[in-house]
């Protein structure tokens, strides 16, 4: 913490301007009034403060707003945003997309994924839901940031907004997030024709249940291996060899290349070896011919 000193009269600050770059840390602490700083935050980013000086300015704002900064200050943080921790940001209430845009621009090129994720979370909370304007802002200024939101936050996305989401925006989404988004996408694209539907639903298929994957296998979609390997393990395991062959079409050859990777490996182990042999790919590890498969989990459920 910066030690408290009294401000020399000749150093008194009446406005935030470039002269402050010549102030030492303790002079900034003693001479800059926090309320003046907050009122003139829009000037701060144009002044080439050192990171040490920015630390002092942050400290002043923290003292003035222990419960979190008001949006009027947040909007003009500029490079001071780089000094914020997720804990600082968690105290904010942000509703303006202009504020979000400004801070996303500042964070670009810096390792701030945790701060950005928290900021986006605060915006969604502040606006009440993940509306189309918010999604459009995220896709434009922060591709992939949609996936920084928790499944709980993503559940506030109305299906009507799903069309604005691009495949690259879902790239870093995990299974739990896709579990939330997939049913919304299914609803949003339900009136589309087969091939158009597949193109749209494909990035969301990591959240699809087995029955939907089975249905796709009947539609000549020729699913690529990248999509197949994003499917939930639980959705892939019950598929038959014939269903996987239909689902992948000409891409079925790729199973050989990926046979060591989950979920392909897990699926192979569940198939009869003679069924796998019908693919002619040399896939190994299936259940040997003549073996009986007992599903003990079913028996336990009955007893």
């Amino acid at each position: 913490d910066v030690e408290r000193t009294t401000c020399p009269p000749e150093k008194e600050v009446h406005e935030i301007d470039e002269s402050l770059i010549f102030y030492k840390k303790r002079e900034l602490e003693a001479c800059v009034d926090a309320a003046l700083l907050a009122a003139q935050m829009d000037r701060v980013d144009a002044i080439p403060f050192t990171y040490e000086q920015l630390d002092v300015l942050k400290h002043k704002l923290d003292e003035l707003y222990p419960q979190g900064y008001p949006e009027s200050v947040i909007r003009h943080l500029g490079h001071l945003f780089l000094k914020m921790s997720p804990e600082d940001i968690r105290k904010w209430n942000v509703t303006s997309l202009e504020t979000l845009k400004a801070l996303l621009k500042v964070s670009k090129g810096h390792e701030m994924s945790a701060q950005v994720a928290t900021l986006i979370d605060r915006v969604v909370v502040g606006r009440g839901q993940l509306d189309k304007d918010t999604v459009d802002t995220l896709t434009a200024f922060c591709p992939g940031c949609l996936c920084s939101l928790s499944p709980e936050r993503l559940s506030s996305v109305p299906p009507s907004v799903i069309g604005a989401v691009r495949p690259q925006d879902l790239d870093t989404c995990g299974p739990r997030q896709l579990d939330v988004l997939y049913p919304k996408a299914r609803l949003a694209f339900q009136n589309m024709s087969g091939s158009e539907y597949f193109v749209k639903i494909r990035p969301f298929l990591g959240g699809a249940p087995t029955e939907d994957v089975k249905a796709l296998s009947q539609q000549n979609v020729s699913m690529d291996l990248a999509t197949f390997m994003k499917l939930r393990r639980e959705a892939v395991l019950p598929l038959t060899v014939a269903e996987v062959q239909k689902l992948l079409g000409p891409h079925v050859e790729g199973l050989k290349v990926e046979e060591q990777h989950s979920p392909v490996r897990d699926w192979i182990l569940k198939q009869r070896q003679d069924d796998l042999d019908t693919l002619g790919l040399g896939l190994q590890g299936g259940i040997p011919n003549g073996y009986l498969i007992l599903d003990l989990s079913v028996r336990e459920a009955l007893s």
């Epitope: 790239d171 291996l225 990248a226 050859e253 790729g254 989950s262």
Partner: antibody, heavy 119, light 106 residues
């Protein structure tokens, strides 16, 4: 334009570990596996292993099991390879190479990271 | 493990000359892939799925073969083709490369 940018050369002591990174740009990171290949001076190429960024599923050439640890960070489109218990035999150039899921070839390669293990 | 044997290990050719190098496999494989590597550079994909030219590769390069015998041909040697060429297989685990053919310009 697709690029795989690897970390710089490393000079390390025997018995230590090193972590090499490979940052991908210009395409969908999760549509490709990231593979790693070793090349000792004047010798051929040796496949170390690969990782699927979607599932973090890894496979290793048995020869490098326990020697190499592959990880990815999807949020930064970066793949990592940690090499442990280093000996002079690990002195080589290490390449990351991108492999489209379901395809058996490497369409883009990093520039290589030279690792020298010497006391 | 599948072993890929490339021959010759070293060869030289004059500009304009036709060049053929081979990759023999100890077990039948579905496809072979070919790479070119120049000193101090990374390998570059030339041919995938035995005979398909990779993006940006000159048409003087071609690949052929099946089963256990594969070859790479350069219809007319150019100075910039001086490099080491490697074949690779992905039909069986672990995935292996040949020992390389070093092609020099006469």
């Amino acid at each position: 334009e697709v690029q795989l940018q690897q970390s710089g050369p490393e000079l390390v002591k025997p018995g230590t570990s090193v972590k090499i990174l490979c940052k991908a740009s210009g395409d969908t990171f999760t549509a490709y596996n990231m593979d790693w290949v070793k090349q000792r001076h004047g010798q051929s190429l040796e496949w170390i292993g690969d990782i699927n960024p979607n599932t973090d599923s890894t496979i290793y050439n048995q020869k490098f099991e326990g020697k190499a640890i592959l990880t990815v960070d999807k949020s930064s489109s970066t793949a990592y390879m940690e090499l442990r218990s280093l000996t002079s035999e690990d002195t080589a150039v290490y390449y990351c190479a991108r492999r489209k899921l379901g395809r058996g070839y490497f369409d883009y390669w990093g520039q290589g990271t030279t690792l020298t293990v010497s006391s | 493990q599948i072993v890929l044997t490339q021959s010759p290990a070293i060869m030289s050719a004059s500009p304009g000359e036709k060049v053929t190098m081979t990759c023999s496999v100890n077990l039948s494989v579905r496809y072979i892939y070919w790479y070119q590597q120049k000193p101090g550079s990374s390998p570059r994909l030339l041919i995938h799925d035995t005979s398909n030219l990779a993006s940006g590769v000159p048409v003087r390069f071609s690949g052929s073969g099946s089963g256990t015998s594969y070859s790479l041909t350069i219809s007319r040697m150019e100075a910039e083709d001086a490099a080491t060429y490697y074949c690779q297989q992905w039909s069986s685990f672990p995935y292996t490369f040949g020992g390389g053919t070093k092609l020099e310009i006469k």
